[in-house]
């Protein structure tokens, strides 16, 4: 049975040319997490294996950072840059796990951090 | 005694294909994160690819969609195929294992002796 | 990819004394959730395959003598034998596993 919960940094906006932390937080299971993958619709960005490492992605590599932690940070940000994200935790033995961030991006100076949610 | 014996190297023509084979010995391959590094005559260490206890797969960018690895549990093997051969792909093959712990360390602590790859015409 | 440089590429040290090889890596390799260094070291003999001695840049694996130290952080790391043996002759690796891994050129050390 999946116990676990993803709380994420929810809805968020940001300033076009600045940079944005996408955060995921899994809590209240034991399951070890394997690898973390964070798409954004049906593109993969990075991930971080528990044994490998960060893989970012070629496309995206010269605007996207891995972390802090498990997290990713988007950098020159563009209005093309909203829209859905994903953090997906593969753990054993749960299983996935899948966590949203909306993301949007701003042409104006008055972006503003939307509230944390959790999504069972 | 923990053991990892390659076999299935050889000499290929460039567009050929092998298949490497990796058996462990004194751990159960199925719990494990298992790898495969090459290393090219008188040079350093690549990563190739990776598969993890539950069947993750990795590749290095230079092998993808060429090289595949799989693994076989009840044989306790690792296996490697590699398609569409290339000079620069002539290297000894290793298979190596994931150091497990409580945290993991991404650290190889168990290598084969490693089995000789050769792409020539 | 991060790039893994070592110094210097081959290094000739009196039996007893120190040995010191550098690894320099383009990107940090410290991870900031459980402040860990993720770079290990290998030696590897001729004809035969690697092995490790330190994982997490300053940890020695297990049956690896205490001649062996890692030292360092974030993008610049240290082998030092502290006192060289003739069965230390061997080509030294450092690897990052911040980023999928990535090895560096290797040192040779030899006696002197």
């Known amino acids: 049975m999946m116990t676990g919960t993803i709380e994420t940094t929810g809805n968020i906006s940001a300033e076009k040319g600045g940079s944005i932390i996408l955060q995921c937080h899994l809590s209240s299971t034991t399951a070890q997490v394997t690898q973390v993958n964070w798409e954004q619709q049906d593109q993969l960005l990075a991930i971080c294996n528990a044994d490998l490492g960060w893989h970012i992605s070629p496309s995206f590599k010269d605007r996207v950072a891995p972390g802090p932690g498990l997290g990713l940070t988007l950098q020159s940000l563009t209005v093309n840059d909203t829209g859905e994200y994903f953090c997906i935790y593969h753990t054993y033995p749960d299983g996935t796990y899948t966590g949203r961030i909306f993301l949007e991006v701003l042409e104006s100076s008055v972006a503003e951090h939307g509230a944390r949610f959790q999504i069972p | 005694e923990v053991q990892l014996v390659e076999s299935g190297g050889g000499l290929v023509q460039p567009g050929g294909s092998l298949r490497l084979s990796c058996a462990a010995s004194g751990f159960t391959i199925g719990g494990y994160s298992m790898n495969w590094v090459r290393q090219a005559p008188g040079k350093g260490l690549e990563w190739v690819s990776y598969?993890?206890?539950?069947?993750?797969?990795h590749y290095a960018d230079s092998v993808k969609g060429r090289f595949t690895i799989s693994r076989d549990n009840a044989k306790n093997s690792l296996y490697l195929q590699m398609n569409s051969l290339r000079a620069e792909d002539t290297a000894v093959y290793y298979c190596?294992?994931?150091?497990?712990?409580?945290?993991?360390?991404?650290?190889?602590?168990?290598w084969g002796q490693g089995t000789m790859v050769t792409v020539s015409s | 990819d991060i790039v893994m440089t070592q110094s210097p590429d081959s290094l000739a040290v009196s039996l007893g004394e120190r040995a010191t090889i550098n690894c320099k890596s383009s990107q940090s390799v410290l991870f900031s959730s459980n402040n860990k260094n993720y770079l290990a070291w290998y030696q590897q003999k001729p004809g035969q395959p690697p092995k490790l001695l330190i994982y997490w840049a300053s940890t020695r694996e297990s049956g690896v003598p205490d001649r062996f130290s890692g030292s360092g952080s974030g993008t610049d790391f240290t082998l030092t034998i502290s006192s060289l043996q003739a069965e230390d002759v061997a080509v030294y690796y450092c690897q990052q596993s911040y980023f999928f891994p990535t090895f560096g050129g290797g040192t040779k050390v030899e006696i002197k």
């Open positions: 598969i993890s206890s539950s069947s993750t797969i």
């Open positions: 190596a294992r994931h150091r497990i712990g409580r945290s993991p360390s991404r650290a190889f602590d168990i």
